[in-house]
């Protein structure tokens, strides 16, 4: 549950977008789940995946849209402050996290061309940084009508309010558990060796543990791979090199919140793995 207690907006703007691509886009995340997307071509904040079905108040997405249009204007305005041709990529990470005592901790940091260079100082109510480009952008943003106040409101009030609303209304989505479907396969490697690959498909939440046993004893975790699927679920795999002919001594153990207990995965027979 801990990982769900954050609401983060990942904002990106580019000074020279390719034709037909947006100059500004946003993904909104509740813990590890993307719930929102926005881009400057559509100009509308929209729910993602299962969040389409969340029972939200009628004006909720209009408010998200209004806030992100303000952010779009600010981000694209930043490039004017920098001058020159660029190209520039400006990113923002804005949001909040609920602590154990239910208090909200805001986050507001910015990167230019992948380097963190600016933040929003909540005490001062201003953007700040040391580099020339940070000061140029912050100065430009300060000149925008009530921009700093809007940022404060967004971070201190809108964000925690939205997060608590989602925890309330979208509890089903946040508590979604999808157990992994599993496979353990062997393939020849260098002479005299095979590679065992234990694969987990379509699981949620993303926390998952894979490990190998040899004749019931720990044989390590192997070399792993992990990534998201387009539907919001995740996939993972782990590979271990073993001696040829020894494969059948191994099994894979998977632990996941969607499983009542650790699952033992046996090696597939060669006929089945075709």
């Amino acid at each position: 549950a801990e990982s769900h207690l954050s609401l983060l907006y990942h904002l990106t703007a580019v000074s020279s977008p390719a034709p037909g691509t947006p100059a500004f886009w946003v993904s909104g995340w509740l813990g590890p789940q993307q719930y929102l997307s926005y881009n400057s071509l559509r100009g509308e904040a929209e729910p993602c995946g299962a969040w389409v079905w969340e029972n939200q108040v009628s004006w909720y997405w209009e408010k998200e849209t209004t806030d992100l249009r303000i952010k779009e204007k600010l981000f694209l305005e930043a490039f004017k402050a920098l001058g020159g041709k660029g190209p520039y990529t400006l990113q923002g990470l804005l949001g909040c996290e609920l602590g154990p005592d239910n208090t909200s901790v805001p986050t507001a940091k910015f990167a230019l061309n992948g380097e963190e260079f600016m933040n929003f100082d909540l005490k001062q109510g201003t953007w700040g940084g040391d580099w020339p480009e940070a000061l140029a952008i912050s100065q430009r943003w300060q000149q925008q009508d009530k921009a700093a106040n809007k940022e404060l409101t967004f971070l201190l009030f809108s964000c925690p309010h939205r997060l608590r609303e989602h925890l309330e209304r979208g509890r089903g989505n946040l508590e979604w558990k999808e157990p992994p479907s599993m496979r353990l396969k062997a393939r020849p490697s260098s002479p005299g060796f095979s590679v065992l690959t234990c694969s987990a498909f379509s699981f949620y939440p993303p926390e998952l543990q894979l490990r190998f046993l040899r004749n019931g004893l720990a044989a390590g975790t192997g070399q792993g791979d992990f990534g998201p699927n387009s539907d919001g679920s995740f996939h993972a795999s782990s590979s271990l090199t073993v001696k040829s002919g020894d494969e059948h001594h191994y099994c894979c153990i998977v632990q996941h919140a969607g499983l009542a207990q650790p699952l033992r995965v046996e090696l597939e027979s060669p006929a089945k793995s075709s």
Epitope: L82, G84, E115, A136, Q139
Partner: antibody, heavy 121, light 106 residues
Framework: QVQLKESGPDLVKPSQSLSLTCTVT?????????WHWIRQFPGNKLEWMTY???????NYNPSLKSRISITRDTSKNQFFLQLKSVTTEDTATYYC??????????????WGAGTTVTVSS | DIVMTQSPAIMSASLGEEITLTCSAS?????MHWYQQKSGTSPKLLIY???NLASGVPARFSGSGSGTSYSLTISRMEAEDAATYYC?????????FGGGTKLEIK
């Protein structure tokens, strides 16, 4: 092409203020980029001091912050360094430089020839 | 502040020799710039962002590195390369320069 030229006194007495001017030709200091003062001590060590961005925003090396200021005169396309309460440790060659942006990076592309300032009584 | 240490402080090389100058940062930096300063003149940009040659710089110069360790290589030393070379970082405020490596002809 853009050129920078430093000017100011060759000799300053300890505890006095040092004032230097950088005159820019071939590019407007309000058009873009940032404009810096960097000094080089007799042992050749380089120290970045301060900048003024084309937007007018300024910043300083924390080690000098209490006694340094940078200003500009946009009508003359000049920017200025003032260093207060100088000591013999401030004896150096003072350079003005432009920091530009290109290919996703910022770097000092043009430097003035430098002006040598000696602090001595 | 990030401290930049250049080594060696002074280096003598024969014409045609390959030379490598190093710059070590006290904390990891994203990229490094290199400047060349000939006697009695101001520093001149040589390499920006670790490995990109500045305009007009001969191809015998190259740069590489990452994290805390960066280097500048001259594939074949020429007489006009006798100068002091400085590295400079811009990853962590304030801007800092290395102490320089003076390259002389043997």
């Amino acid at each position: 092409q853009v050129q920078l030229k430093e000017s100011g006194p060759d000799l300053v007495k300890p505890s006095q203020s040092l004032s230097l001017t950088c005159t820019v030709t071939g590019y407007s200091i309000t058009s873009g980029y940032s404009w810096h003062w960097i000094r080089q001590f007799p042992g050749n060590k380089l120290e970045w001091m301060t900048y003024i961005h084309s937007s007018g925003s300024t910043n300083y090396n924390p080690s000098l912050k209490s006694r340094i200021s940078i200003t500009r005169d946009t009508s003359k396309n000049q920017f200025f360094l003032q260093l207060k309460s100088v000591t013999t440790e401030d004896t150096a060659t003072y350079y003005c430089a432009r920091e530009v942006y290109g290919n996703y990076y910022w770097y000092f592309d043009v430097w003035g020839a430098g002006t040598t300032v000696t602090v001595s009584s | 502040d990030i401290v930049m240490t250049q080594s060696p402080a002074i280096m003598s090389a024969s014409l045609g020799e390959e030379i490598t100058l190093t710059c070590s940062a006290s904390s990891s930096v994203s990229y490094m710039h290199w400047y060349q300063q000939k006697s009695g003149t101001s520093p001149k940009l040589l390499i920006y962002s670790t490995s990109n040659l500045a305009s007009g710089v001969p191809a015998r110069f190259s740069g590489s590195g990452s994290g805390t360790s960066y280097s500048l290589t001259i594939s074949r030393m020429e007489a006009e390369d006798a100068a002091t070379y400085y590295c400079q970082q811009r990853s962590s405020y304030p801007y800092t320069f290395g102490g320089g490596t003076k390259l002389e002809i043997k």
